[in-house]
Amino acid sequence: LPEMAQPVDPAHNVSRLHRLPRDCQELFQVGERQSGLFEIQPQGSPPFLVNCKMTSDGGWTVIQRRHDGSVDFNRPWEAYKAGFGDPHGEFWLGLEKVHSITGDRNSRLAVQLRDWDGNAELLQFSVHLGGEDTAYSLQLTAPVAGQLGATTVPPSGLSVPFSTWDQDHDLRRDKNCAKSLSGGWWFGTCSHSNLNGQYFRSIPQQRQKLKKGIFWKTWRGRYYPLQATTMLIQPMAAEAAS
């Protein structure tokens, strides 16, 4: 695959130029129906590239993708803030970019999970993502679609900050979840989910190692390392926000 250079701030006379789409949903609204890599520019943000998934529900921005273990997800706060990985493969879009897309709006968060037997699960949440001043806290703003949500995400109204090994914001005082597990995540009590954990191609024998994997407790269990995950976000219209 071609190498992607780091985005730079282009200096040009904006007055004669057309505004880039703010997100994947806006691309969908102007008639784009093909999924793929697009350039967007949320309000107040420099332009950046995103994977858009166009569906019958509109345009969704892919914010995370895991499927082969090619990218190390055990990274510090600044990496999770800025984003990392390969837009054609495994990546984390970056908390600041995601927040620039959602702004102050409530959003739909879709989580696609796949196990090693080819089974798949799709979960949808209504969420609000805070800015860096809240440690990018994720707040559930409505009940979860499906049966798997109740013990996986915070109860409606409770915010869970994002944590990494070097920025511990989890809800446990006695433990640094990101350090004892792996990767950065909205860790509550360390045991409900972690889609940014270590990628295992085969199941390790030691439970101590296994707990560091990619898991979603209420689907395949706490100690089942998932084969693939994708997270997508779609801001709701401003009037839909509470």
């Epitope: 789409p21 697009f38 350039e39």
Partner: nanobody
Framework: EVQLVESGGGLVQTGGSLRLSCAAS????????MGWFRQAPGREREFVAG????????FYGDSVKGRFTISRDNLKNTMYLQMNSLKPEDTAVYYC???????????????WGQGTQVTVSS
């Protein structure tokens, strides 16, 4: 849609340089990703370089990395390919393309223009 015309090709010696241009007509040029592709005689068309609408992100094929530089001037509706340290294997017809999506696979495009011939002699 954007209409495209390539120019700047020619005959150059090994180690030399050329600058290709791709002039676009049509509205909203800065919303479009632009790419350079090439096709040598008897070979498949291949991706050379690409640039996002704002110019903020660039992409290069492995064979040209470090030698070619893609750029664009959104006020002039023009994209450029600066080709340095040219080799005989760079000899090909060079084409430009545009799309809303970032596309590096030439098979995803339907229509191709005339292109501009680049010949590198040894």
């Amino acid at each position: 849609e954007v209409q495209l015309v390539e120019s700047g090709g020619g005959l150059v010696q090994t180690g030399g340089s050329l600058r290709l241009s791709c002039a676009a007509s049509g509205r909203s040029f800065n919303l479009y990703y632009m790419g350079w592709f090439r096709q040598a005689p008897g070979r498949e068309r291949e991706f050379v370089a690409g640039i996002s609408g704002s110019g903020g992100s660039t992409f290069y094929g492995d064979s040209v990395k470090g030698r070619f530089t893609i750029s664009r001037d959104n006020l002039k509706n023009t994209m450029y390919l600066q080709m340095n340290s040219l080799k005989p294997e760079d000899t090909a017809v060079y084409y430009c393309q545009s799309s809303r999506r970032i596309i590096t696979n030439p098979r995803e495009y339907g229509y191709w223009g005339q292109g501009t011939q680049v010949t590198v002699s040894s």
